[in-house]
Amino acid sequence: ECGHISVSAPIVHLGDPITASCIIKQNCSHLDPEPQILWRLGAELQPGGRQQRLSDGTQESIITLPHLNHTQAFLSCALNWGNSLQILDQVELRAGYPPAIPHNLSCLMNLTTSSLICQWEPGPETHLPTSFTLKSFKSRGNCQTQGDSILDCVPKDGQSHCSIPRKHLLLYQNMGIWVQAENALGTSMSPQLCLDPMDVVKLEPPMLRTMDPSPEAAPPQAGCLQLSWEPWQPGLHINQKCELRHKPQRGEASWALVGPLPLEALQYELCGLLPATAYTLQIRCIRWPLPGHWSDWSPSLELRTTERAPTHHHHHHHH
């Protein structure tokens, strides 16, 4: 190799200056004894190279790019060789930003997959390869004192969420959890969450059903619906409150909310609806009175209210 580039830093803050040096060895005898070293950033020639002959006979050109405004570019030094430009060496330059503090870190405990799923917002684009790591530890108290560290959780590329499996969790005990972001320009850490995985539990919703008409039960009145629900079995022993929502199937009506209902109600008569109208109903639940996350809304149940009974006009005869 006849030439070699060295740079002050191959990765800089976007807009920062960068200094580069290109040295041409003396033993490249086929070259012009006083060659003019040229600089190119991407496809553009860059003026301003200061060239000098060193005591050992090598030629050096130094250039300062006042602002590197490209997030990625190749810087090359070259010589005119006949009618063409002979590239001696090139380096990749990267520019970007250090990672912003990850924010809006939140977690939920999924009892079916037995994992604590945490997600966050990574902040603005850094233009550099940036790694995120979900870090955590077990704590007996309120996370002021750190207990056993938990294996780092590294999300798949481009994802802003990570799952901590059950074997690294202790239920009914606090955990300190935070996200660390790192790239070539720096490291940042989100504020730490301190939580008991059970306090962020997200249950599955109950299954809505039509109430089976029993011979002794009165049929629903006009504008009423009788429905029941089957609790999600794995969450059966968790105290919960639930809420229903309903809307007519036709038209543009928005959802109407009914609640809170205790999960234990298991059946409900919903009144005040339009008679002879098809309704869509859904239910969701949350651990309560202890903390938790609302479940998703259940699959829809579609039911029709009964018709209003015909009104009988009684004619009174006066004698």
Partner: antibody
Framework: EVQLLESGGGLVQPGGSLRLSCAAS????????MGWVRQAPGKGLEWVSS????????PYADSVKGRFTISRDNSKNTLYLQMNSLRAEDTAVYYC???????????WGQGTLVTVSS | DIQMTQSPSSLSASVGDRVTITCRAS??????LNWYQQKPGKAPKLLIY???NLQNGVPSRFSGSGSGTDFTLTISSLQPEDFATYYC?????????FGGGTKVEIK
Amino acid sequence: EVQLLESGGGLVQPGGSLRLSCAASGFTFSLYWMGWVRQAPGKGLEWVSSISSSGGVTPYADSVKGRFTISRDNSKNTLYLQMNSLRAEDTAVYYCAKLGELGHSLAWGQGTLVTVSS
Amino acid sequence: DIQMTQSPSSLSASVGDRVTITCRASQGISSYLNWYQQKPGKAPKLLIYYASNLQNGVPSRFSGSGSGTDFTLTISSLQPEDFATYYCQQSYSTPLTFGGGTKVEIK
């Protein structure tokens, strides 16, 4: 300290009835599911029934469905098991249990023996 | 109903031995598997809940693992007070069901 104290066991004839009680202390009784588990002499554990914190949900084992009724009085911190139409195979030590949110039995009473025999 | 099959039904071991008891569910139960220890004439005692969570006050030589249908209780170094009968129990759905038990005896 959590304490569960069963009472009401004894000798009863087949077809007879018995009511077991479990007095609870040391925790907020009204917030927990409670249950009954039995163990026949020399045998393993068998879940009988559970009851939700306010009494609205009461699953039963098939072997006792329609004959046993679980109930609770949160004002008295007491769990009950009304056992009717008793059979010889109901002979067992009956344990009262405080259940955790994941269905595990956090605490157990010392048990009360029910013997069904003529 | 979910059936729970425990094995072995009994085993002989010495103090200091590593002991492993397995429990298999007839269908997937996620992590809803609990382990209890019972000594003669006494009520059962909770050791492990939700497959791997050690109940407060239980020595760390007890550990649980597994998910889905296959679960394991391990006693890393058997102590004299550990000779007892051990039961697994699923709490994924009612009826709650127990395994048949494993009696750990002194060799």
